[in-house]
């Protein structure tokens, strides 16, 4: 069964006029790539490259296309049925807890750890302890900072932003 977006979640002033007659539960909805007219009678196409809708809906407006930020590359353009897909540039990644920006991947693992995962657009390099093989949780400093810290003194984590 197709997913659909209805006006129930919208503010009252954004809702379209009620349909006079619905011969099925979904009559009065418009297909993906469209929104409904103010009088609720017609379906109006989203504008290619400007806005979109992904599901059957009775929205008065299509959703605005995302513009990729600097530091991101456009994987696929916005169409009337699908939003733009943006991805972090090579050497940067987007964390789940800070999805608003791409952050620089670390250049290497701290002393005593080995790299088991590369930098990808959605994850930093992955480091594990040589002996135990357990993952290092949280941010760890890059190789250069580890090397410069005094023996016996743990290096403090630094926050790298893209």
């Amino acid at each position: 069964e197709s997913a659909l977006i209805t006006q129930q979640d919208l503010a009252p002033q954004q809702r379209a006029a009620p349909q006079q007659k619905r011969s099925s539960p979904s009559e009065g909805l418009c297909p993906p790539g469209h929104h409904i007219s103010e009088d609720g009678r017609d379906c109006i196409s989203c504008k290619y490259g400007q806005d979109y809708s992904t599901h059957w809906n009775d929205l008065l407006f299509c959703l605005r296309c995302t513009r990729c930020d600097s530091g991101e590359v456009e994987l696929s353009p916005c169409t009337t049925t699908r939003n733009t897909v943006c991805q972090c540039e090579e050497g940067t990644f987007r964390e789940e807890d800070s999805p608003e920006m791409c952050r620089k991947c670390r250049t290497g693992c701290p002393r005593g750890m080995v790299k088991v995962g590369d930098c990808t657009p959605w994850s930093d390099i992955e480091c594990v302890h040589k002996e135990s093989g357990t993952k290092h949780s949280g941010e760890v400093p890059a190789v250069e900072e580890t090397v410069t810290s005094s023996p016996g003194t743990p290096a403090s984590p630094c926050s790298l932003s893209g």
């Epitope: 069964e1 011969s23 099925s24 539960p25 196409s45 290619y48 009337t80």
Partner: antibody
């Protein structure tokens, strides 16, 4: 390959009804919207309405709303268009056509069904 | 309803000619226009959508352009098999409407 196969030609008297069928094959029936478009002899094309099997959504052109009924039998992947209170100006070739759930252009068409209304 | 006015309604050209068919919408339809080719006794075939995107398998001699209210279908070098009637269609707002057609023949 995608095929839309329509029922055969019909001759009807004014005031009668006609029911034309369109059997779809070669794709997932519930993923595309099916439409009815008609063409009077020597004339242009006129969109009548759609049926979407994925959620049973139906939309009619207001011009035909009182006389047309579009239904479907999902078990046989068939869509039907019934036009009632026929008049001579309803003489036309009736096409079913499909479109993806996006922009409203038609990528595949049935072969057409000629409906002749004559007393 | 949006009216789609096609011109000319009849066109005669020679093989190899560049042929242009125009379509004017009665109101702004953005780029939501499709073009179809229909041969006698056959169903229409999709050529162009979104004003300028060629449908799969359509020869590259067919091209479309335009936005807003004025649209053009161009055949860069007319071939004998292009003899047909051509229709524009707006897919911007329901009811979707078609132009009256342009009948193209070879001189």
């Amino acid at each position: 390959q995608v095929q839309l196969v329509q029922s055969g030609a019909e001759v009807k008297k004014p005031g009668a009804s006609v029911k034309v069928s369109c059997k779809a094959s070669g794709y997932t029936f519930t993923e595309y919207i099916l439409h009815w478009v008609r063409q009077a002899p020597g004339q242009g094309l006129e969109w009548m309405g759609w049926f979407y099997p994925g959620n049973n959504n139906i939309k009619y052109n207001e011009k035909f709303k009182d006389r047309v009924t579009i239904t479907a039998d999902k078990s046989t992947s068939t869509v039907y268009m019934e036009l009632s209170s026929l008049r001579s100006e309803d003489t036309a070739v009736y096409y079913c056509a499909r479109h993806e759930q996006g922009p409203g252009y038609f990528d595949y068409w049935g072969q057409g069904t000629l409906v002749t209304v004559s007393s | 309803d949006i009216q789609m006015t096609q011109s000319p309604s009849f066109l005669s050209a020679s093989v190899g000619d560049r042929v242009t068919i125009t379509c004017r919408a009665s109101q702004d339809v953005n780029t939501a226009v499709a073009w179809y080719q229909q041969k006698p006794g056959k169903a229409p075939k999709l050529l162009i959508y979104w004003a300028s995107t060629r449908h799969t398998g359509v020869p590259d001699r067919f091209s479309g352009s335009g936005s807003g209210t004025d649209f053009t279908l161009t055949i860069s070098s007319l071939q004998p098999e292009d003899v047909a009637t051509y229709y524009c269609q707006q897919h911007y707002i329901t009811p979707w409407t078609f132009g009256g057609g342009t009948k193209l023949e070879i001189k």
